[in-house]
Interface confidence: medium
């Protein structure tokens, strides 16, 4: 196989008895993406697969970047919080049991949720064989794979390969269509010697040789252009050092009252379980660990406050206190922990060192192609398409990997809008109620009428503002029974949610400005009722007077209007959103400084922003009754997060509203918190921390959609599968490995 040129078969070349291509899912644990480029000459077989087939620059692992969570994510398409294997070690208070890789408890089906690929295949009449895979020797939903091997790490790789080849030789009636294969390398060697070590180089040669044996075996059976093979890894690997340790004894006078899962992705819970599990004061722990040292190498979070892109919160097994650790550092209880040096993983899944490989080859895959990175939650849907079966519900976005396939099996379409919109009509330029709002600059009702009359756009003006400010179409509402209306302005368009009494989204386009100086200040102390929205559906300005902690923010920044006259279009109740004062500082800095910078760098940006309500921190928009539960004696619910989606043209010679090709996206989901303690901003100007904070909370457009019940880009003229690629793209700014 190795000696031959790449075969370019237009359709599958399967021998007699192979009606449809088998699928082999092959995992090499801890194979970080960089190995593929640095050591390519040492791995001729894997390198040939890369050259002849399709590969991504890298595949993103899910957080924490550990073995069991990610292997099970790959075969279920679910986030660890959804499938339950949230770490290699964990405690479940409901089961009152501990899960670890060294105990038989790992084979208790109660730990394993979701539907793994082998069951999906079997439920639809196909056979499945697993040569090791986390979960494969567990009776998930009462069933095992058709063929499986109890895990034994000492079985030589060559023996594993020859067994899989024997399975392919089985009679048609007994032969599986789906296979898994698992190698512990190069992870074991990476742990022992670190990612840049002779041991890893040796391990790469060993796994390449075994992989070559598989490909040669397929060739001998004339299956090398019949089998669809996916070669991937669960995560990467990074170097650790014994002088890069954070000890909890440096932060607490005593540590015996808590238990800590140590390492690159630490969690802290009560020591005395189950008794103290729920009463444990997680908030106090986080407070004690926040902003304690100028060079602190971890950030403490309550899990609901972690970046939403991680989807690591909604599971009782995920302890409430989480430490987000710097690259190559470890956080442990005390100096008695000497488990350092060598390699480790589990870190932030945006770190380049945590990136995993993805290569694929076979009749269904495109050839000699490199694709942009994607997340491992997408692989399950892809494998279902290869097997021509229906996936179980999962966190992947079906169709987002269609560009890997010669002929896509599943054609996605845009979601149907669930709640239709109305237009908030303009009746009277005088408000029927002031809603306790004041604008001293409007000294009589003639002036008030004049500024309100500006809200009464003609059809031509509406068409013009939509073209500029909604260049990709208005967000469609996928939540049920959401009474909302569109509000048109010359400089922005918003979708107003009547039950929430606030805009669900606001969309506007910031052009590339000649100068990048910050925006002028907003007209001070000027607010008025929006005459297009009935008072019963509006916020009162007086809502913001009682509790000094909450102030009003503007979703569309009034200062974006270059003249104070047009600022009045934004100084209205329908543009108000509740914000903590500390949060607003950051929000205002982003809009007055960073947004201008982005617009300048990108030849203009379209901005869509809005509130998010995720009180139950499940990554999906809350039902109205969930939000009502959190109304603190007020009509106005306080958002848990705010989103901002910046969209520009990939080809920077075009503006967003005249973009013929691919778009570039930069979405943010910023937790709405009363303090900025996450950034330790004491004594620091905003320029030193706001951008870093926004960058920490970058997300995918898809994450925004799930949290808001909105659907974006429906009017962008582009195949839906390409739009889904855009929606599942996560911008990253990590440069060092």
């Amino acid at each position: 196989w190795l000696e031959e040129n790449c075969d370019t078969a237009q359709q599958s070349q399967c021998p007699e008895g192979f009606d449809l291509p088998p699928v082999i899912l092959f995992s090499m644990d801890g194979f970080r993406a960089e190995y593929l480029y640095t050591w390519d000459t040492l791995m001729p077989n894997i390198n040939k697969l890369k050259t002849c087939g399709i590969h991504s620059k890298y595949m993103r692992a899910m957080y924490p970047t550990k073995t069991f969570p990610n292997h099970y994510t790959i075969v279920t398409g679910l986030y660890p919080e959804s499938h339950g294997i949230i770490d290699n070690n964990m405690y479940d208070v409901n089961l009152n049991k501990n899960f670890s890789l060294s105990s038989k408890e790992q084979n208790n089906p109660a730990w394993w949720h979701g539907q793994p690929m082998w069951l999906t295949a079997m439920y639809q009449g196909l056979k499945a064989a697993t040569y090791f895979w986390p979960g494969s020797e567990v009776a998930i939903n009462g069933s095992f794979p058709s063929i499986y091997m109890p895990y034994n790490g000492s079985v030589p790789f060559e023996e594993r390969i020859s067994t899989l080849l024997k399975w392919l030789d089985l009679p048609k009636a007994e032969r599986p269509r789906f296979y898994t294969m698992y190698f512990e390398e190069p992870d074991s060697s990476g742990h022992a010697g670190g990612p840049v070590s002779a041991r890893v180089i040796k391990a790469l040669q060993v796994v390449d040789h075994a992989f070559g044996m598989l490909m040669e075996g397929l060739k001998q059976r004339n299956l090398h252009n019949c089998v669809n093979i996916i070669l991937l890894a669960d995560h990467g690997m990074d170097q650790t050092y014994c002088n890069k340790m954070e000890y909890m004894t440096d932060y607490f006078p005593r540590i015996n009252f808590f238990y800590m899962y140590e390492g690159p992705a630490p969690r802290i819970r009560a020591h005395n379980i189950p008794h103290d599990f729920f009463s444990f004061n997680s908030e106090e722990i986080v407070r004690n660990l926040s902003c304690r040292k100028p060079d602190q190498h971890f950030k403490p979070y309550l899990t609901p406050d972690l970046p939403k892109r991680l989807h690591y919160a909604k599971n009782v097994r995920i302890d409430k206190v989480h430490l987000f650790v710097d690259q190559q550092w470890l956080a442990v209880r005390s100096k008695s922990n000497t488990n350092c040096g060598g390699g480790n993983h589990g870190y932030n899944n945006e770190f380049r060192s945590m990136e995993a490989i993805f290569l694929a080859h076979g009749p269904s895959f495109k050839e000699k192609t490199e694709v942009e990175p994607f997340e491992n939650i997408e692989v399950y849907n892809l494998m279902c398409d290869l097997l021509r079966i229906q996936p179980a519900p999962n966190n992947g976005t079906h169709g987002s990997l269609n560009h890997l396939l010669k002929v896509p099996f599943y054609e996605p379409s845009h979601a149907e809008e669930v709640s239709k919109f109305s237009v908030c009509g303009f009746a009277n330029p005088l408000p029927t109620e002031s809603l306790d709002c004041f604008c001293p600059h409007l000294q009589n009702s003639t002036q008030l009428e004049q500024v309100n009359q500006m809200l009464n756009l003609t059809q031509e003006e509406i068409t013009a503002t939509v073209k500029v400010n909604l260049p990709f179409g208005r967000p469609r509402v996928l939540q049920k029974n959401v009474d909302h209306c569109l509000l048109y302005h010359r400089e922005y368009v918003s979708g107003f949610g009547k039950a929430m009494r606030m805009p669900m989204w606001s969309s506007y386009t910031v052009p590339q400005l000649g100068d990048t100086s910050p925006l002028p200040p907003t007209v001070p102390d000027c607010l008025r009722a929006d005459v297009r929205v009935p008072p019963s559906e509006s916020q009162k300005c007086s809502f913001y007077l009682a509790d000094k902690n909450i102030t009003h923010g503007f979703l569309y920044p009034p200062a974006s209007n270059r003249t104070s006259d047009s600022q009045y279009d934004a100084l209205i109740t329908s543009n108000l959103v509740p914000m903590y004062e500390e949060f607003r500082k950051m929000w205002d800095y982003f809009h007055s400084v960073l947004l201008i910078k982005h617009a300048t760098e990108r030849n203009g940006v379209n901005v869509v922003s809005g509130p998010i309500f995720d009180y139950n921190y499940d990554g999906h928009f809350d039902a109205p009754d969930e939000i009502t539960k959190h109304l603190a004696n007020t009509d106005v619910p306080i958002p848990t997060h705010y989103f901002v989606v910046l969209t520009s043209c990939k080809n920077k010679s075009h503006t967003p509203e005249n973009c013929p090709g691919w778009l570039d996206v930069l979405p943010f989901i910023i937790p709405h918190r009363p303090t900025n303690v996450e950034s330790c901003p004491e004594g620091k100007p905003e320029a030193l921390w706001v951008e870093e904070r926004f960058t920490a909370h970058i997300a995918r457009v898809r994450d925004v959609e799930l949290l808001t019940g909105l659907d974006f880009y429906q009017d962008k003229v582009q195949p839906v599968s390409e739009i889904l690629q855009l929606k599942t793209y996560l911008p990253t700014f990590e440069t060092t490995i």
């Epitope: 330029p429 004041f438 009428e449 007077l545």
Partner: antibody, heavy 99, light 114 residues
Amino acid sequence: VSCKASGYTFTSYDIHWVRQATGQGLEWMGWMNPNSGNTVYAQKFQGRVTMTRNTSISTAYMELSSLRSEDTAVYYCARTVLLWPFDYWGQGTLVTVSS
Amino acid sequence: DIVMTQSPDSLAVSLGERATINCKSSQSVLYSSKNKNYLAWYQQKPGQPPKLLIYWASTRESGVPDRFSGSGSGTDFTLTISSLQAEDVAVYYCQQYYSTPPWTFGQGTKVEIK
């Protein structure tokens, strides 16, 4: 009921109508911008009251229909700018509704 | 709507004595960022329209004698006539112009000479 303004620019100030039944307090009825003729009425009078103006003679009008005995009152016009109290009042017109 | 409640309903004071009228609003009429209370006091003599005495809770309208003063903030306000004169016999009304429309008035306090 009519209300003729003098001594200032009629269109620069809003006209409000307030009534007072004998021996009772003051009750706000509605508001008109003489410049545009736009009006806002108190909920209680919605559908029964109409406020108009003739700028050429600097006069505001208030019409109340379907009168009942409890509408017997003195009807005042008053002027104001938007977020200020009523600085000048008309002398009032007594309207008596009899069966 | 904001409800204004005055006390007492009527008041008899000797000439030259102090008269104090209270007014309570059902919600705050203080616009905190301007630190202004949107409250006015009017005087109405028999057979006459009301006359503006005080606005912003404590600012005297021009031409109003300085024996009239207003105080208070938020929801509780007071009109004080420091030395009652015969011409001060009237009904006094407080009015909020904070949450409008509607502009709402207190029920009135009648001041007489004892």
